[in-house]
C-alpha cells in the first residue's frame, strides 16, 4: 500500500486523496532521524498512512480533524 | 497475481448457519482491511460487513447485525463470514473485497452463491 | 444512510456511441464517490474512484466527474465489451457504504 508505514519514519508518501470521513486522527513526524517531513493519518480502520504535509488536501484534512478533535461531545 | 477465491456457499435451510472463506494471494493479506458485500438475484449490490487489517474493528450493515460475524486468520490469509439464523431475504451472491483505505472496494472475489430455502 | 441514485435504470447504445450516466448522492458527498463495472456472473470491477480518477489498467474512454451530489460517469465510444451494468458507490459515510441501485447498458 503506497503510504502504509512499518516504522516510525515515512519514506513513502500516499498519492491519493483521503476521505476526511475514514480518517480518525493524525500526527507529525518532525524526528530528527526522519529524512522526510511527514503527516500519518490513521483511518477509521485502524491503518496509518503516510501525507506529504505541503499538500493541501493534507492541510485541510488535519485542520478538520483538529477542528473534530476539539468539538466537545454532548 | 491478486487473487480472492471464495467457498463455503450452498443452500441452506432457513434459521441455519453457513460460513463463507476467502483465501487471499498475491498481496499482503495482513495489511489490508476487507469488505463482504452481497447481490440478491437480479439486484444491485448491498454492503454487509467490513474488518480492519488486524481484526480489532468491525462494523456492519444493520440487516445482518447481531447475526452475522465476519473475522480473519492473516496466519492463513483468510477471510471469513459466519452467517447465523440465515433468512429468505439472505439469499445471494456472496463478493469477498478489499478496502483500498480511499474509500472505494477493490479486489474482488469470484462471488459464492448462498441460498435459504426450505 | 446516504441513498444514491442512479438513472437511467436501463440504457440502449450502439457501438461508437458516447454513453453518459448519472449518479446523485441524498446529501453532500464531496468527491468521494466511485463507479463500478459488472458483467454478468462476475464480480464488480473498480472503473473510476474519488469521482473521476481512473484505475490502473482501465481504458480512457471512461471518465468520471462531479462533486456535492451530482456525478457522471461517461463512456466516450462504446465498445462490444462495455455492455455490462453500472454501480456507483459513495464512501462519504463510513462504515455505512451504498451503492446505487445500477444502470444496465444495452446494446441497441
Known amino acids: 500500500h503506497p503510504g502504509s508505514i512499518p516504522t516510525s519514519c515515512c519514506f513513502i508518501m500516499t498519492s491519493k486523496k483521503i476521505p476526511n470521513t475514514l480518517l480518525k486522527s493524525y500526527k507529525r513526524i518532525t524526528n530528527n532521524r526522519c529524512t522526510l517531513k511527514a503527516i500519518v493519518f490513521k483511518t477509521r480502520l485502524g491503518k496509518e498512512i503516510c501525507a506529504d504535509p505541503k499538500k493541501k488536501w493534507v492541510q485541510d484534512a488535519t485542520k478538520h480533524l483538529d477542528q473534530k478533535l476539539q468539538t466537545p461531545k454532548p | 497475481q491478486v487473487q480472492l477465491v471464495q467457498s463455503g456457499g450452498g443452500v441452506v435451510q432457513p434459521g441455519r448457519s453457513l460460513r463463507l472463506s476467502c483465501a487471499a494471494s498475491?498481496?499482503?493479506?495482513?495489511?489490508?482491511?476487507m469488505h463482504w458485500v452481497r447481490q440478491a438475484p437480479g439486484k444491485g449490490l448491498e454492503w454487509v460487513a467490513v474488518?480492519?487489517?488486524?481484526?480489532?474493528?468491525?462494523h456492519y450493515a444493520d440487516s445482518v447485525k447481531g447475526r452475522f460475524t465476519i473475522s480473519r486468520d492473516n496466519s492463513k490469509n483468510t477471510l471469513y463470514l459466519q452467517m447465523n439464523s440465515l433468512r429468505t431475504d439472505d439469499t445471494a451472491v456472496y463478493y469477498c473485497?478489499?478496502?483500498?483505505?480511499?474509500?472505494?472496494?477493490?479486489?474482488w472475489g469470484q462471488g459464492t452463491m448462498v441460498t435459504v430455502s426450505s | 444512510d446516504i441513498q444514491m441514485t442512479q438513472s437511467p435504470s436501463s440504457v440502449s447504445a450502439s457501438v461508437g456511441d458516447r454513453v453518459t450516466i448519472t449518479c446523485r448522492a441524498s446529501?453532500?458527498?464531496?468527491?468521494?464517490l466511485a463507479w463500478y463495472q459488472q458483467k454478468p456472473g462476475k464480480a464488480p470491477k473498480l472503473l473510476i474512484y474519488?469521482?473521476?480518477s481512473l484505475q490502473s489498467g482501465v481504458p480512457s474512454r471512461f471518465s468520471g466527474s462531479g462533486s456535492g451530489t451530482d456525478f457522471t460517469l461517461t463512456i466516450s465510444s462504446l465498445q462490444p465489451e462495455d455492455f455490462a451494468t453500472y454501480y456507483c458507490?459513495?464512501?462519504?459515510?463510513?462504515?455505512?457504504?451504498?451503492f446505487g441501485q445500477g444502470t444496465r447498458l444495452e446494446i441497441k
Open positions: 473485497a478489499g478496502d483500498t483505505d480511499y474509500g472505494d472496494i477493490d479486489p
Open positions: 498475491g498481496f499482503t493479506f495482513s495489511s489490508y482491511g
Open positions: 474488518i480492519s487489517y488486524d481484526g480489532s474493528i468491525k
Open positions: 446529501q453532500d458527498i464531496s468527491s468521494w
Open positions: 474519488a469521482a473521476s
Open positions: 458507490q459513495q464512501a462519504s459515510s463510513f462504515p455505512s457504504i451504498t
